[in-house]
Structures are given as structure tokens and as C-alpha cells.
């Protein structure tokens, strides 16, 4: 997190706000609800209280405007700048302005007013942009989904560095951004994609370029807004320029950042029995056209060419790949070796000699 220079903050805990005008894109009630919810994000984790005024001067004046709107920081028409807010202080201090050339919504269409307001009110309270891609105060807008919003840990640390913690946090679970060099790091899924490696963990993935040590961290939804926040398994089908993503009983086929028509589908359509609730890991072998699908302590082999599950499956993981344990969290194949991830450990397994040749920390894939 980052605070503004000179640690600008309010010297009182009871703050007022006023909605000066409204966007035509939403009902008054929807706008009021979005702003109330956005303030609650911050009051839940601090001693701050927010009270709405209907007239007069409030600490935080909220308005919608277009282009030059009275503060010498003009908006720019659709897209580009969504809004801005001033750090704590007198006059303009704390005020938040929203570009009414955007389409404001309470969904994923256009721009989600609650999400942008929560970010802007972070500025109104003294937070600058964060370098943590999981933070609400990260400068890039990402719609994070319909489920209950949870303020990320980085933002909690930031706002509490200014105002301290509140009495009782009603939502004490604050998602942390994974640390790639945490020795206990386990991974959710791994796949190649157009020559790069995508390593999924929680709401994020690391994107690792070949011959590069520094993996970039992204929110999964910043690339694929329609996917769930977390995924279970993934594999690439390079000859078709597709990747397949699994979550629960559903799976998606993606070309770049586009979901193919007809997806998501049910994993039972692949020939898996109905009692299989999720795929924990998947890996595709381009030379044979086969894909291994792991669930629990079992493995299935799917024929991607003929779209049929191979006979004699499922089999026990321990029988087919002795020594790797009875579950697989993530898996990928490279140069004749399969890399199986089980908790914080990965096993390098030789296809040629059918045995484990190396055991390494899971995060060595991230050059830790």
C-alpha cells in the first residue's frame, strides 16, 4: 500500500458525505446504495463513521460530471479516466468526481459504480495507489465478480496505518496476495499458453515468459472477466490455440481471452462419472492427443482427438505414478517430463523411465 506524501488524513473519525447529483445510468436508490456500500468497505475495518447529508457542505462531496467540470482536472469522454478523488483536506479535499461519460452500473457491464467508488473513497481517506495487483487501490480497474466483496489485506493494512483498526470487523477474511517465495506455497493450476507459463493461485495467476525469471502477477479476472475468481485445473491444446479451464463441475474453452461459444460445459460431457465434483489438475500431451484429468486419488485419460474417455480408466494415481502421493494439485509437461505438484512439493517425473527423478519446492517454478 501507499499513503499520500505528508501522510494526509482526516483528524476526525466522524465524516460526512453528500451526493450532489446523480448519473442517468442508474436509479437514485441504486446510486445511494453503491456509495453507502463503498463507504462501509472502509468503515468496517477502521473507527471511521460516514453520515450522509442531503444539503450543505460535507467533508466528501460526491458528484458526476463530464469533461471540464470545475476543478481543472477535466474528464476525457468515454473510457480512459473513470473518476478521481482528492486526498483529505479542506475545500476540494476528500471530494470524489465520477465521469458521467462512462456507463455506470451495479453489474459487470460498463463500470461498476460501487467498485470505482470504493477505490476513490480510498483516495478520499488518504490512500494512494498500491503496487499490489490484488489491492482495491491498484490503479487498473478489474471487475471482481458478483460475489460478496472482500477488502484485500493490502488495503486493510494501508487504511489501518492511517486510522487504526475498528472495534469489530464483520468480515475478518481479507484476501492476501500470494507471495511466490512463501515456502509453504501450493498451486491451483498450471498451463502453458502460447509459449508462456500460467501459474494459478487463488484469484491470481503468474505469467512466466520463457528465459525470464520475474513472473508477472495478474488477477485472473483482469484477463477473463467471465471466469470464476479461482480455478481448479487448466491445460493447453496448442494445435487448436485453446486452453481449457476447470472449476467445480464446469469447464471453459478459451481462445486468447475469448470464451468459445457453448461454454461453460459440464465435466460429465467429457465422460466423467456424475460423482466427480471437480478436476484437481489436468495435462495435455500434444504428441498423443491425450489429456490426463486428476480428481481425488484417481486419474482419467481423455482422447482429445476422438472426444472420448479412454477405456481402463479411472486408475489410481499411486499406481500409474508411484511416489507422487495420492493427489495432484497442479501438473504440466515439458520436454518429456511431467511436473506434479502436491502441496508445497513438486515431483519431476520422467515419462521415458516412468519414475521420479527430482523432488523440488513447488515455488521453484517461480524461480524461488
Amino acid at each position: 500500500y501507499n499513503v499520500f506524501p505528508r501522510t494526509l488524513k482526516w483528524s476526525k473519525m466522524n465524516l460526512t458525505y453528500r451526493i450532489v447529483n446523480y448519473t442517468p445510468d442508474m436509479t437514485h436508490s441504486e446510486v445511494e446504495k453503491a456509495f453507502k456500500k463503498a463507504f462501509k468497505v472502509w468503515s468496517d475495518v477502521t473507527p471511521l463513521n460516514f453520515t450522509r447529508l442531503h444539503d450543505g457542505i460535507a467533508d466528501i462531496m460526491i458528484s458526476f460530471g463530464i469533461k471540464e467540470h470545475g476543478d481543472f482536472y477535466p474528464f476525457d469522454g468515454p473510457s480512459g479516466l473513470l473518476a478521481h478523488a482528492f486526498p483529505p483536506g479542506p475545500n476540494y479535499g476528500g471530494d470524489a468526481h465520477f465521469d458521467d461519460d462512462e456507463t455506470w452500473t451495479s453489474s459487470s457491464k460498463g463500470y461498476n459504480l460501487f467498485l470505482v467508488a470504493a477505490h476513490e473513497f480510498g483516495h478520499s481517506l488518504g490512500l494512494d495507489h498500491s503496487k499490489d495487483p490484488g489491492a482495491l487501490m491498484f490503479p487498473i480497474y478489474t471487475y471482481t465478480g458478483k460475489s460478496h466483496f472482500m477488502l484485500p489485506d493490502d488495503d486493510v493494512q494501508g487504511i489501518q496505518s492511517l486510522y487504526g483498526p475498528g472495534d469489530e470487523d464483520p468480515n475478518p477474511k481479507h484476501p492476501k496476495t500470494p507471495d511466490k517465495c512463501d515456502p509453504s506455497l501450493s498451486l491451483d493450476a498450471i498451463t502453458s499458453l502460447r509459449g508462456e507459463t500460467m501459474i494459478f493461485k487463488d484469484r491470481f495467476f503468474w505469467r512466466l515468459h520463457p528465459q525470464q525469471v520475474d513472473a508477472e502477477l495478474f488477477l485472473t479476472k483482469s484477463f477473463w472477466p467471465e471466469l470464476p475468481n479461482r480455478i481448479d485445473a487448466a491445460y493447453e491444446h496448442p494445435s487448436h490455440d485453446l486452453i481449457f479451464i476447470f472449476r467445480g463441475r464446469k469447464f471453459w474453452a478459451l481462445n486468447g481471452y475469448d470464451i468459445l461459444e457453448g461454454y461453460p460445459k459440464k465435466i460429465s460431457e467429457l465422460g466423467l462419472p456424475k460423482e466427480v465434483k471437480k478436476i484437481s489438475a489436468a495435462v495435455h500431451f500434444e504428441d498423443t492427443g491425450k489429456t490426463l484429468l486428476f480428481s481425488g486419488n484417481q486419474v482419467w485419460r481423455y482422447d482429445d482427438t476422438n472426444h472420448i474417455m479412454d477405456k481402463d480408466y479411472p486408475r489410481l494415481i499411486e499406481e500409474d505414478f508411484p511416489g507422487i502421493g495420492d493427489k495432484v494439485d497442479a501438473v504440466y509437461e515439458k520436454n518429456g517430463y511431467i511436473y506434479f505438484f502436491n502441496g508445497p512439493i513438486q515431483f519431476e517425473y520422467s515419462i521415458w523411465s516412468n519414475r521420479i527423478v527430482r523432488v523440488m519446492p513447488a515455488n521453484s517454478i517461480l524461480w524461488c
Epitope: 468515454p78 480512459g80 473513470l82 473518476a83 480497474y141 481471452y257
Partner: nanobody, 120 residues
Framework: EVQLVESGGGLVQPGGSLRLSCSAS????????MGWHRQAPGKQRDLVAT???????KYADSVKGRFTISRDNAENTVYLQMNDLKPEDTAVYYC??????????????WGQGTQVTVSS
């Protein structure tokens, strides 16, 4: 780094048509807006047509009804179909893309430009 490559410019008579295309080589980097601007000699660069962040289209008044912007998401490509071209449409046409930011300026990504000349 987003790289934009335009094609389709050329010399055309008044009343004629051209189709410009712009391809973004981005891997799977998500683009927010993508569209076309133009710059006539001695003038500033102006918006012609763009896809906004919410998938709507926006056109300059001077091209409405004559130009149509379209795109192919799978290919990260945007097109500009220009009909009933006029001499005043003569300009270098630039492809433009941005990413979504909250309140700081998005990086602007520009193509090299393709020349369109309307003359008899």
C-alpha cells in the same frame, strides 16, 4: 507492450470506399478501448471512431453514417469501413488502444499510421 499494426490505406476517388484494419499483437493482454484517430496535414489528431469500454461505438459527427467500426475479438483486430469518402477525409489514420484505469491516465498505444488520400 501492445503493438498495433494498421493496413488498408491508399488513394481513392471521392465517393469511393476503403477498409482499414488494425491488429493488436498483445498475447492475451486485455485491451479496454480500441479504435481509430486521424491527423490531416497541419491539424491535430482527432477521434474518428472507437469501441468504448462498455462495447458501445462512438463516432466523430463528420463520419456518422459513412464510416463503420467493427472488430474481431478472437483476433484482437479492429476494422474501419469507410464509404462515400470525401477529400476532407484525407489524413493519416492511426489505430489506438487503451487499458482500463480508475483515475490515472491509461497508457496510450498507437499504430504507425496508414495514409488515406481522397482525390480525383
Amino acid at each position: 507492450e501492445v503493438q498495433l499494426v494498421e493496413s488498408g490505406g491508399g488513394l481513392v476517388q471521392p465517393g469511393g470506399s476503403l477498409r482499414l484494419s488494425c491488429s493488436a499483437s498483445t498475447g492475451i493482454f486485455r485491451i479496454n478501448t480500441m479504435g481509430w484517430h486521424r491527423q490531416a496535414p497541419g491539424k491535430q489528431r482527432d477521434l474518428v471512431a472507437t469501441f468504448t469500454s462498455d462495447d458501445n461505438t462512438k463516432y466523430a459527427d463528420s463520419v456518422k453514417g459513412r464510416f463503420t467500426i467493427s472488430r474481431d475479438n478472437a483476433e484482437n483486430t479492429v476494422y474501419l469501413q469507410m464509404n462515400d469518402l470525401k477529400p476532407e477525409d484525407t489524413a493519416v489514420y492511426y489505430c489506438h488502444a487503451t487499458t482500463v484505469m480508475y483515475d490515472s491516465n491509461s497508457p496510450d498505444y498507437w499504430g504507425q499510421g496508414t495514409q488515406v488520400t481522397v482525390s480525383s
